[in-house]
């Protein structure tokens, strides 16, 4: 005969655990139902009655199956240097990320504490490493034979066009100028762009373990070292 299915609340067999989406209530000493995401426990179970769940109120949420007496408050509205990439719903918290063209310069357990504008490489310098959601752009001087004539956080150094006859030689910040005869090889018009980073940072990130050399204080998520600002510029 098949085993009889127990309905919550029920007393578990000695040494056994409650089933999926159930929890053991210490007071009732019974296995009781958890509440689904978007709900919370309005009334805890007893020996004779199961958990009574209720929907989360506005601006509160529960993301997991739970038996919490109150839903969690959604975070504050996003700061003006951030954008809301996920709205507060009954089942998930609001997520704020740095706005496009910015990156997270300092993370804390609550999410991004400081957003900063991505470095712009000035003429004569191109992007060596694009910015990400947590790291700044790295600029590098344009090597001989390449140039960048823009102030940009995305443009890389481009090769000079190759002329049959050079009118003005190119340099790090200017393309070569050919005489009226067309160049033998030319780059496609327009600057070469690197893709902007896509931000996915949650407002409530888990802290990473500290490196063994870290100070003993409760610490932020460390970022990698930043290059010097040579070749970068403000707006």
């Amino acid at each position: 005969l098949p085993a009889q299915v127990a309905f919550t609340p029920y007393a578990p067999e000695p040494g056994s655990t409650c089933r999926l989406r159930e929890y053991y209530d210490q007071t009732a000493q019974m296995c009781c139902s958890k509440c689904s995401p978007g709900q919370h426990a309005k009334v805890f179970c007893t020996k004779t009655s199961d958990t009574v769940c209720d929907s989360c109120e506005d601006s509160t949420y529960t993301q997991l199956w739970n038996w919490v007496p109150e839903c969690l408050s959604c975070g504050s509205r996003c700061s003006s240097d951030q954008v809301e990439t996920q709205a507060c719903t009954r089942e998930q918290n609001r997520i704020c990320t740095c706005r496009p063209g910015w990156y997270c310069a300092l993370s804390k357990q609550e999410g991004c504490r400081l957003c900063a504008p991505l470095r712009k490489c000035r003429p004569g310098f191109g992007v060596a490493r694009p910015g990400t959601e947590t790291s700044d752009v790295v600029c590098k001087p344009c090597a001989p034979g390449t140039f960048s004539n823009t102030t940009s956080s995305t443009d890389i150094c481009r090769p000079h066009q190759i002329c049959n006859v050079v009118a003005i030689p190119g340099n790090a910040s200017m393309d070569a100028v050919c005489t009226s005869t067309s160049p033998t090889r030319s780059m496609a018009p327009g600057a070469v762009h690197l893709p902007q980073p896509v931000s996915t940072r949650s407002q409530h990130t888990q802290p990473t373990p500290e490196p063994s050399t870290a100070p003993s204080t409760s610490f932020l998520l460390p970022m990698g070292p930043s290059p010097p600002a040579e070749g970068s510029t403000g707006d």
Epitope: S76, D81, E110, G111, C112, P225, S226
Partner: antibody, heavy 124, light 112 residues
Framework: QVQLVQSGAEVKKPGASVKVSCKAS????????LSWVRQAPGQGLEWMGW????????NYAQNLQDRVTMTTDTSTSTAYMELRSLRSDDMAVYYC?????????????????WGQGTMVTVSS | DIVMTQTPLSSPVTLGQPASISCRSS???????????LNWLQQRPGQPPRLLIY???NRFSGVPDRFSGSGAGTDFTLKISRVEAEDVGVYYC?????????FGQGTRLEIK
């Protein structure tokens, strides 16, 4: 006690560079950020940028980004601020200020300890 | 950039009397982490600035309890319950909610 001691006054010609030091003592250097703030004679305070002493990351005020570099020497608990291509309007008292922003929970998130200031005169 | 505007720019006060300085920001200083990073600094003549109040209303260590901060969002106030001679100087509000960090233009407190 916790303190920041800055290098002495400097007199520079326009176009030159200046490097101001700020030696920290009495606290764990790596656990804090350091900001640099300047004050022109008779004027208010202007934020120049900051350095995260833990990892060396920097962010600068956009109007100074081309000319300023902030560094640290963790072995001596000293921060440095170099300003290049000096102009007459760079004449100011330059302050370093500890920024209690790195610790996770009980930080003030404010500039809580200030150096005594370094006067930089730019004159031809 | 967030612009910080202080009023008044100068405040003559009688010793033992209260004083109040207002600071208004051009946009809300409430961070997405729920904190409001508005601080008050005091700069006595010939000295570096000194932190008085952080996160709107928290007195920094060693600051006398006659100093208090209040406010929310974009409007903040520093109050001195009974002005003493050593309180003479310039008071600045500053926001560290977001880059760039900005300061108010300063309020000069002087004795009548």
């Amino acid at each position: 006690q916790v303190q920041l001691v800055q290098s002495g006054a400097e007199v520079k010609k326009p176009g030159a560079s200046v490097k101001v030091s700020c030696k920290a003592s009495g606290y764990t250097f790596l656990s804090y950020g350091l900001s640099w703030v300047r004050q022109a004679p008779g004027q208010g305070l202007e934020w120049m940028g900051w350095i995260n002493a833990y990892n060396g990351n920097t962010n600068y005020a956009q109007n100074l980004q081309d000319r300023v570099t902030m560094t640290t020497d963790t072995s001596t608990s000293t921060a440095y601020m170099e300003l290049r291509s000096l102009r007459s309007d760079d004449m100011a008292v330059y302050y370093c200020a500890r920024w209690d922003i790195l610790t996770a929970y009980y930080s003030s998130d404010a500039f809580d300890i200030w150096g005594q200031g370094t006067m930089v005169t730019v004159s031809s | 950039d967030i612009v910080m505007t202080q009023t008044p720019l100068s405040s003559p006060v009688t010793l033992g009397q209260p004083a109040s300085i207002s600071c208004r920001s051009s946009q809300s200083l409430v961070h997405s982490d729920g904190n409001t990073y508005l601080n008050w600094l005091q700069q006595r003549p010939g000295q570096p600035p000194r932190l008085l109040i952080y996160k709107v209303s928290n007195r920094f260590s060693g600051v006398p309890d006659r100093f208090s901060g209040s406010g929310a969002g974009t409007d903040f106030t520093l109050k001195i319950s009974r002005v003493e001679a050593e309180d003479v100087g310039v008071y600045y509000c500053t926001q560290t909610t977001q880059f760039p960090i900005t300061f108010g233009q300063g309020t000069r407190l002087e004795i009548k």
